[in-house]
């Protein structure tokens, strides 16, 4: 650690005195302290001499000697008072800038330690300090305003009592800045804009911050627009607003608009797009397939996206048949607005009944005209199966009718014993009917197919089963020949309630 001579913590001299401060270290040393015009510095290897042969009040201050090569960063200090009866204060800075709630040191150094008892801090022109100003004083450093507030941004003077009168320092301007959490908050309204050529439009860019020192501008396709700025202060925030008014828009007004605000913390920007169109438009679309298939008893939401300008004048969902003249319940129709010009309309169809299959149309209207989007809803059903014994062209025939959607496939099984359903161990024979006859196939209805199994002789201790299946499920019917006549068994689980 360097050593200072004289080896005292503080030195008091009179103006005009010769002062020599010598610092000695192991390596090269350097002095630091308030820059003063009256010092002369002589360095000689491991020692450095700071001297003046005409000390003035401006030499008052703390002088520190450090050894730059010392890894421990040790230093020594001495405080010098030059007690000038006419100049009780040496002010080291004319402006002090702090953030709110920080301590603000006003660096007016007392030139004579004897005066400490009569010091005070005042605002310029002798005005008293604001209420709740909490401060302390150090003759080496000056006055500290603790936890400074924005409202305490003032010009201050240090006052000392000399011979019964108050002697003031030059003024120190304190700037207390609000703690700025980040760049200004921004809004750009609207978020999107569409206008027909010749209509009026307005775009508003506004920024706000706790501190007044910020800039805001609006730019169109990277060109900064010259717009008068309106300023305001409310809710403890400064606001700056730029309003672009266009009386008659044209295509050159279209494009990207960016609202940009910046302060010491950085920059924020937000953008919107302005579309200028020749005439009104209305577009309907859906992310769903317009042909829908749903299992009976399940639910379905039909969604339509609408893009329109100007806004819609009317819209509704309509059921176009073919089963009944019922119309969708309004409570099941739902509209959500994604943004100003895009909306989603949803029709909820819970627990679909057979009579609700068919066409559903969404219709919308705006000044551009009517548009419609139609969905076709087909219900899926698991197969229903029935088997009868009959004679066709004199041959004994088992006739299986299966009804469902999608079109069922048919398989015949012959198994030993009497059973409601053939299991693998009992199966004697299996016949697949790849091309059953389609008896009916109308849009939105079940498909009914018929499969024939010609049987020369009915074996009485056997069961003939017709099985049908599709993507929804399966159904079967067991036919048991008995001496008193054919007997049929639909399986228990076939009891179906949609």
């Amino acid at each position: 650690i360097p050593v200072i001579e004289p080896s005292v913590p503080e030195l008091v001299v009179k103006p005009g005195a010769t002062v020599t401060l010598r610092c000695v270290g192991n390596g090269s040393v350097e002095w630091d302290g308030p820059p003063s015009p009256h010092w002369t510095l002589y360095s000689d290897g491991s020692s450095s001499i700071l001297s003046t042969n005409n000390a003035t009040f401006q030499n008052t201050g703390t002088y520190r000697c450090t050894e730059p090569g010392d890894p421990l960063g040790g230093s020594a200090a001495i405080h010098l008072y030059v007690k000038d009866p006419a100049r009780p204060w040496n002010v080291l800075a004319q402006e002090v800038v702090v953030f709110e709630d920080q301590d603000a040191l006003l660096p007016c150094l007392l030139t004579d330690p004897v005066l400490e008892a009569g010091v005070s801090l005042v605002r310029v022109r002798g005005r008293p300090l604001m209420r709740h100003t909490n401060y302390s004083f150090s003759p080496w450093h000056g006055f500290t305003i603790h936890r400074a507030k924005f409202i305490q941004s003032q010009d201050y003077q240090c006052s000392a009592l000399m011979g019964g009168r108050k002697v003031m320092s030059i003024s120190i301007r304190l700037k207390v800045q609000k703690v700025i959490p980040g760049p200004p908050a921004l809004t750009l309204v609207p978020a999107e804009l569409v206008r027909i050529r010749g209509e009026a439009a307005q775009i508003v860019c506004s920024a706000s911050s706790v501190d007044v020192n910020f800039d805001v501008f609006l730019q169109h396709n990277n060109t900064k627009l010259a717009i008068p700025q309106q300023s305001d202060f409310h809710n403890n925030r400064y606001q700056k607003v730029l309003t672009l008014n266009l009386d008659q828009v044209d295509f050159q007004h279209a494009g990207n608009y960016s609202c940009v605000a910046s302060n010491v913390q950085g920059k924020h920007s937000t953008s919107m797009f302005f579309r200028v169109v020749e005439s009104a438009y209305l577009n309907l679309s859906s992310e769903q397939n317009l042909i829908q298939e749903v299992t009976v008893g399940e639910g379905l939401n039909l969604k339509v996206m609408v893009e329109a300008y100007p806004g819609l004048q009317g819209f509704n969902w309509t059921y176009l048949g073919p089963f009944s003249d019922h119309q969708p319940e309004p409570k099941l129709a739902n509209a959500t607005t994604k943004d100003t010009y895009r909306h989603t309309f949803t029709l909820s169809l819970p627990r679909l009944k057979p009579s609700e299959a068919g066409r559903y149309s969404f219709l919308a209207r705006n000044p551009g005209g009517w548009r419609a989007l139609t969905f076709e809803l087909t219900l899926r059903y698991p197969p229903e199966v029935s088997v009868i014994w009959t004679f066709i062209n004199g041959s004994g025939t088992l006739l299986c009718a299966a009804s469902g959607y999608p079109q069922p496939n048919v398989t015949w099984l012959q198994c030993s014993g009497h059973t409601d359903r053939c299991d693998e161990a009992q199966v004697l024979q299996v016949w697949d009917d790849p091309y059953p006859e389609v008896l009916s196939q109308e849009p939105f209805h079940k498909v009914t197919v018929q499969s024939l199994l010609t049987v020369e002789t009915l074996e009485h201790n056997q069961t003939y089963e017709c099985r049908a299946h599709n993507s929804v499920g399966s159904g079967s019917w067991a036919f048991i020949p008995i001496s008193a006549g054919a007997h049929t068994h639909p399986p228990d689980e076939f009891l179906f309630t949609p």
Epitope: E30, W31, D32, G33, P34, P35, S36, P37, H38, W39, T40, L41, Y42, L50, Y63, R64, T66, P68, G73, S75, L92, A93, Q94, E95, V96, V97, L105, L106, P107, H141, G142, I172
Partner: antibody, heavy 116, light 110 residues
Framework: QVQLQESGPGLVKPSETLSLTCTVS????????WSWIRQPAGKGLEWIGR??????TKNPSLKSRVTMSVDTSKNQFSLKLSSVTAADTAVYYC???????????WGQGTLVTVSS | QSVLTQPPSASGTPGQRVTISCSGG????????VNWYQQLPGTAPKLLIY???QRPSGVPDRFSGSKSGTSASLAISGLQSEDEADYYC???????????FGGGTKLTVL
Amino acid sequence: QVQLQESGPGLVKPSETLSLTCTVSGGSISSYYWSWIRQPAGKGLEWIGRIYTSGSTKNPSLKSRVTMSVDTSKNQFSLKLSSVTAADTAVYYCARLTVVGALDYWGQGTLVTVSS
Amino acid sequence: QSVLTQPPSASGTPGQRVTISCSGGSSNIGSNTVNWYQQLPGTAPKLLIYSNNQRPSGVPDRFSGSKSGTSASLAISGLQSEDEADYYCAAWDDSLNGPVFGGGTKLTVL
């Protein structure tokens, strides 16, 4: 060895604010006084102001437009010069100010041009 | 217009001794110490002399400074080609409460 490095935009539009930062390495910023100096092309040096942790003192000819601050956590000090004109076009230097008022360590300088 | 006055140019041949003058007033050179800076082309100024006649470490003893009243001078002996640079005098100014500079002297080594 103390080193200083200026940084900031090289081009500023008239009437806007010039902002520069000086980063100090090889020494603690809180132990010394620091200065900003500028030099228009082909001309002499002009002192802008000095700053240390407790405050600043500015050249009276620029006082109303100058703001200086210190960030000890980053070992940086900064200069802001508002309402700039073409006359503010210069190379801006940061430097350390010694106890005898000499500028012993300088940054390499950064050219700031004021133009629209 | 600089506060301190220097000749705009000076010249000399290698090995020669040249002197650059600097004059000021009572609020600067008259009451405070003088510093000199050397600025090589395209570089930042470098402290050459402080406290009227003190050289920072690394500055050759060919460079020396002196002060008398409100004037100061920088002498360079044994002139070398690498000494070709701009030289600025500076002094603390009491009214400015900061340093003032001369307009600079361009030294040419012929």
